[in-house]
């Protein structure tokens, strides 16, 4: 189709080489058709489309995204050619940063219902650059945490080095929905609820003498509980003796509950004590068996191919540790009688 009639928007993605970050493009089709099949209110009231209204019907359910190759080849369907780009309704998600994402992206409704609809499309010219060293080194992260039940804030990474006074007007989105009242480089969350978790996008306009473009950053916001004040506790084994059959294989499980920590480095290991000697056993990797907002239960097994007489003289010790402290639970094997 002819893309010369598409409205055009220029976007800049400056990514940090130090962190993983994502990016999104919204299919900002002119009103009123967008509300039939995209999130409503993506455009702010001041962004009035300059082109013909789209006469789409209510059964539109999706849009089609294309990339325009720089060599003039025909448009390529995003879904077929770019595995690191995911389409979700009217939003295009870039999972990995890189200058190779630069280019022109076009979106339009999948179903064309009237002659006007042919021109109902948006062309987004995306420029992707790595952040230069001259940029602010203490810029806000693209992954930000909010502590449940307390006051918090979400900062726009591309503007976090500027004071509120000198910051340009910012347009914020949460999970693709325009937050029309939020206009500064920082959103204050009076009281954090689970509701505040999600993908936030901040946009602001930058201009030079020739043109203007939208600078965009994406922030993944996670709601968390406060760091635990407790050392981990061992849920299993509970008993300090275990009846076993000699010559049979044996698996002893150690399950421990670790409270939430923002910087989480749990330790769970088995070691063996035999008279004055003790050594760590190489056992299968630990695995998380239950994870909630407040804590995580991790399990690690010790496997004996067959229980020997010597094992009955040893103590098998599960050792667990977090930043607060450690806990141990030892198990003595006892031969089953009769």
């Amino acid at each position: 189709f002819n893309i010369s009639g598409c409205s055009t928007k220029k976007l800049l993605w400056t990514y940090s080489t130090r962190s993983e970050e994502e990016f999104v493009l919204f299919c900002d089709l002119p009103e009123p058709q967008k509300s039939h099949f995209c999130h409503r209110n993506r455009l702010s009231p001041k962004q009035v489309p300059e082109h013909l209204p789209f006469m789409g019907s209510n059964d539109l359910s999706d849009v089609q995204w294309y990339q325009q190759p720089s060599n003039g080849d025909p448009l390529e369907d995003i879904r077929k050619s770019y595995p690191h780009i995911i389409q979700d309704k009217c939003t295009l998600h870039f999972l990995t940063p890189g200058v190779n994402n630069s280019g022109s992206y076009i979106c339009r409704p999948k179903m064309i219902k009237s002659p006007y609809d042919v021109a109902c499309c948006v062309k987004m010219i995306l420029e992707v650059k790595p952040q230069t060293n001259a940029s602010c080194e203490y810029s806000a992260s693209h992954k930000q945490d909010l502590l449940l039940g307390s006051t918090g804030s979400i900062s726009c990474p591309s503007l976090s080095c500027q004071s509120d006074a000198q910051s340009p007007a910012v347009t914020w989105y949460k999970n693709g929905k325009l937050l029309s009242v939020e206009r500064s480089n920082r959103i204050v969350v009076d009281e954090v609820y689970d509701y505040h978790q999600g993908t936030y996008v901040c946009d602001y306009t930058q201009s030079d003498t020739v043109s203007s473009w939208t600078v965009r950053a994406v922030v993944q916001v996670r709601t968390i509980v406060g760091d635990t004040k407790l050392k981990p506790d061992i849920l299993d084994p509970v008993e300090d003796t275990l009846e076993v059959e000699l010559g049979k294989p044996l698996t002893i499980s150690c399950k421990a509950r670790f409270g939430f920590e923002r910087v989480f480095n749990p330790v769970i290991k088995w070691y063996i004590k035999d008279s004055d000697l003790e050594w760590e056993v190489s056992v299968p990797e630990a695995k998380s068996i239950k994870s909630t907002l407040k804590d995580e239960i991790i399990e690690r097994n010790i496997i004996l191919e067959k229980v020997t007489q010597r094992d009955l003289r040893r103590k098998f010790v599960c050792f667990v540790q977090n930043s607060i402290g450690n806990t141990t639970q030892s198990v003595q094997l006892k031969e089953k009688r009769g």
């Epitope: 325009l178 009076d190 609820y193």
Partner: antibody, heavy 121, light 111 residues
Framework: QEQLVESGGGLVQPEGSLTLTCTAS?????????MCWVRQAPGKGLEWIAC????????TYYASWAKGRLTISKISSTTVTLQMTSLTAADTATYFC?????????????WGPGTLVTVSS | DVVMTQTPSSVSAAVGGTVTINCRAS??????LAWYQQKPGQPPKLLIY???TLASGVPSRFKGSGSGTDFTLTISDLECADAATYYC?????????????FGGGTEVVVK
């Protein structure tokens, strides 16, 4: 028993100023609460004016028409005020103090009986 | 600011009947909407919050529904005591749960 009482209403000259006070009893302002002012002109509907968050951020929120001329403040753990300047006849109304907040905005709902402000010469 | 538009401005129904009041937000407010009842000379009384959650002590004859931009309050088995003015209110401001804009009100007359 939790209660809100508004005071400070009365007759005021056009272009004059007035400060309304909302006093809480039976509870004190804390996190999760927004203390708000709402007004109702005689025979008309409810009109939101402003809210202040009672927790640490102290964030204030205003209806666009109220910005600059009306100021909401938390004076103590039981008192919120609304300062009004450049009053006109259009500001004649019963002014209500209300408590809202929590996940959903109104779980802690409580209203005062209102105080009447009349702007007239 | 979000603009809340309430329809109709007045509605009448017989005792035992049903009335439906609509409220439309100028932008997506998810489910952050409250409904109030106000009688002359009294402050408003909360009926429903989060679009459909009944406030304590409110009879189940009052039912709220909707999300996004379109919301409805339905009062069934009307009683004389239900004669009042009903208002919707948006309770989301950006990312914060701030009670803010009201609809224009709907007067319910019970015959």
């Amino acid at each position: 028993q939790e209660q809100l009482v508004e005071s400070g209403g009365g007759l005021v000259q056009p272009e004059g100023s007035l400060t309304l006070t909302c006093t809480a009893s039976g509870f004190s302002f804390s996190s999760s609460y927004y203390m708000c002012w709402v007004r109702q002109a005689p025979g008309k509907g409810l009109e939101w004016i402003a809210c202040i968050y009672a927790g640490s951020s102290g964030s204030t929120y205003y209806a666009s028409w109220a910005k600059g001329r009306l100021t909401i403040s938390k004076i103590s753990s039981t008192t919120v005020t609304l300062q009004m300047t450049s009053l006109t006849a259009a500001d004649t109304a019963t002014y209500f103090c209300a408590r809202g907040g929590g996940s959903g905005g109104v779980d802690n709902n409580l209203w005062g009986p209102g105080t009447l402000v009349t702007v007239s010469s | 600011d979000v603009v809340m538009t309430q329809t109709p401005s007045s509605v009448s129904a017989a005792v035992g009947g049903t009335v439906t009041i609509n409220c439309r937000a100028s932008e997506d407010i998810e489910r952050f909407l409250a409904w109030y009842q106000q009688k002359p000379g009294q402050p408003p009384k909360l009926l429903i919050y989060k679009a459909s959650t009944l406030a304590s002590g409110v009879p189940s004859r009052f039912k709220g529904s909707g999300s996004g931009t379109d919301f409805t309050l339905t009062i069934s088995d009307l009683e004389c005591a239900d004669a009042a003015t009903y208002y919707c209110q948006c309770t989301l401001y950006g990312v914060n749960f701030v009670p803010n804009a009201f609809g224009g009100g709907t007067e319910v007359v019970v015959k």
